[in-house]
Every structure is written in C-alpha cells, then in structure tokens.
C-alpha cells in the first residue's frame, strides 16, 4: 500500500519545509485515496469483464451511491461553500459502509483497500474541522447500515463483482467532485 | 427450498399470443428482479425481459420489445409473460429465473440465482 501523505520519505528529507495549511492537506489526502481507488480498479478490470460491460449488462441499480446534485452547491454554477461541504462530508459517512463491503474483495490489494476505508475516515476528520455547521450533517442510521451490508454480502459472485466495481467508480467520481468543489473554498 | 415453475408453453401459429407463468415457492419474490430468458436450440441463453421488485420497472431486450410484456402479482408470487405477435424465431425453451436480494437488475444470467426448469415454445409458419 502507498504510504499514506505526510510520511513519505521527501517529507522527513525536508525539514524545514513549511507545514501543509488545512487545504493543501485535504487536497493531498483526496488524491492519496485516488490514486487508490485507481490501483483498486485496476485489479477489478483485470479480473472480470465488468468494466466494459457494465453499461450494458446493468437495467437497474438501487445501490443508492452518493452522487453530486445541482443542489447541493458543490458545481460551478451555484456555487455554495457551506452547502457543498456538509454534501461531501454526508457523502464521504454514506460511503463507509460501502467501503466496508470493499474489504475481503480484494486478493492482491488487501492493504490498498483497508488505506483508501482509513484514509477516507481521517478525510472525513480533516472536513469536519473545516465545517462550521456540523449540526446539518446527518450521520447514517447503524442498523440500516448493517442491513445494506448484509444485502451486499448475501449478492452472488457476479452481482457482487459488479456491484464492487459500481462503488469503486462512484466513489472516484464522488471524490472528483469533491476535490474541485474544495479548491474554489 | 426455492423452485421456479414455468407453464403456459405450446405450440402456436405465427402472428398468435402465449401467456407463459412462472410460480415461485420457498420464498417470497415480491422484492427481488425476475426475470425471463430463452434458449433456442444450438444457441445460448438470452435475456427476454425482466421487471424489478422494487420499482415495477420492465426491461425488454430489443427483439421482443412491442411484442412482450413482462408482469408480476406479488400476492400469488408469480411472474408473467404475455407474448403476442409470435414469429418463428421467438421458437425457444423459456425459462424463469429470480434474483435474490434486489439491489442490482441485470440482462445477464449470471446475475440470477434460481432457475426454472423451461416451458418450450413452438412458433410454426
């Protein structure tokens, strides 16, 4: 697994470099979680045909993955910093368990995918500092979470390796939209 | 344990109409995709249609579609499959098959998990 920012060796070599300001380390940590996902679809694509089929094999999804809306204020037009911070950190909580369900579906990137669920939880610290109205962020219900779970779990081998690769481009998608949104605050 | 049970296969004319059923037993279907496939002789399995469990929707593939309609009624747990203005390539062994937790609904076989054993359909010119 990729070292995660802030302890790579140019760091230690560095002293005296200026410490990261809240935002360019919130920007090194999205890109650290996708160069991740990328190392994760790698594999994924490598196993199974489900990255070109996908469209088509696919007439409907209730996964309920979250998904950048005009509403949310995270988009050029419309722009709304508050707004579109509490929908990247309810996003970034929504897609835990998701990323739960990554683990164990992986053979060769077993620690990638345990560094993109643990640097995403401290992600989720970093943006919750920055937040100023952290009362508008709604946390997803535990047991609602354990059930989605469950259901992932109990999908057979072929809904499961599509369903895995559906999380992993949401997720890169979601993140991509979040890394832009950040860099207009 | 789950059984899929097709009926309603015959031998019928071009341009004729066949209601295939399909009962499930074991479990309940109302939330899962069904759906239904064909498999004519020397060719493989391909997706006819499908309808969700949550949302009702209906998929056809594009040689049925006007011509097929796909149905359920969750109290009889049951699924349908009215087919009107048969042709002689609709000819084919028509099976049922069920998915089992409903977060995904896909055209393709594997994603399904119970099978029917197939009810034949014979359309003559």
């Known amino acids: 697994a990729p070292v995660p920012p802030g302890e790579d060796s140019k760091d230690v070599a560095a002293p005296h470099r200026q410490p990261l300001t809240s935002s360019e380390r919130i920007d090194k940590q999205i890109r650290y979680i996708l160069d991740g996902i990328s190392a994760l679809r790698k594999e994924t694509c490598n196993k199974s045909n489900m990255c070109e089929s996908s469209k088509e094999a696919l007439a409907e999804n209730n996964l309920n993955l979250p998904k950048m809306a005009e509403k949310d204020g995270c988009f050029q037009s419309g722009f709304n910093e508050e707004t579109c911070l509490v929908k990247i950190i309810t996003g970034l909580l929504e897609f835990e368990v998701y990323l739960e369900y990554l683990q164990n579906r992986f053979e060769s990137s077993e620690e990638q995918a345990r560094a993109v669920q643990m640097s995403t939880k401290v992600l989720i610290q970093f943006l919750q500092k920055k937040a100023k109205n952290l009362d508008a962020i709604t946390t997803p219900d535990p047991t609602t979470n354990a059930s989605l779970l469950t259901k992932l779990q109990a999908q057979n081998q072929w809904l499961q390796d599509m369903t895995t690769h559906l999380i992993l481009r949401s997720f890169k998608e979601f993140l991509q939209s979040s890394l832009r949104a950040l860099r207009q605050m | 344990e789950v059984q899929l049970v097709e009926s309603g296969g015959g031998l019928v004319q071009a341009g004729g109409s066949l209601r295939l059923s399909c009962a499930a037993s074991?479990?309940?279907?109302?939330?899962?995709?069904m759906g239904w496939f064909r498999q004519a002789p020397g060719k493989e399995r391909e997706f006819v249609a499908a309808?969700?469990?949550?949302?009702?929707?209906?998929y056809y593939a594009d040689s049925v579609k006007g011509r097929f309609t796909i149905s359920r009624d969750n109290a009889k747990n049951t699924v349908y499959l009215q087919m009107n203005s048969l042709k002689p390539e609709d000819t084919a062994v028509y099976y049922c098959?069920?998915?089992?937790?409903?977060?995904?609904?896909?055209?393709?076989?594997?994603?399904?998990?119970?099978w029917g054993r197939g009810t034949q359909v014979t359309v003559s010119s």
């Open positions: 309808i969700s469990g949550r949302s009702g929707n209906t």
């Open positions: 098959a069920g998915e089992r937790v409903g977060l995904l609904l896909t055209v393709v076989a594997e994603g399904y998990d119970y």
């Open positions: 074991g479990r309940t279907f109302s939330s899962s995709p």
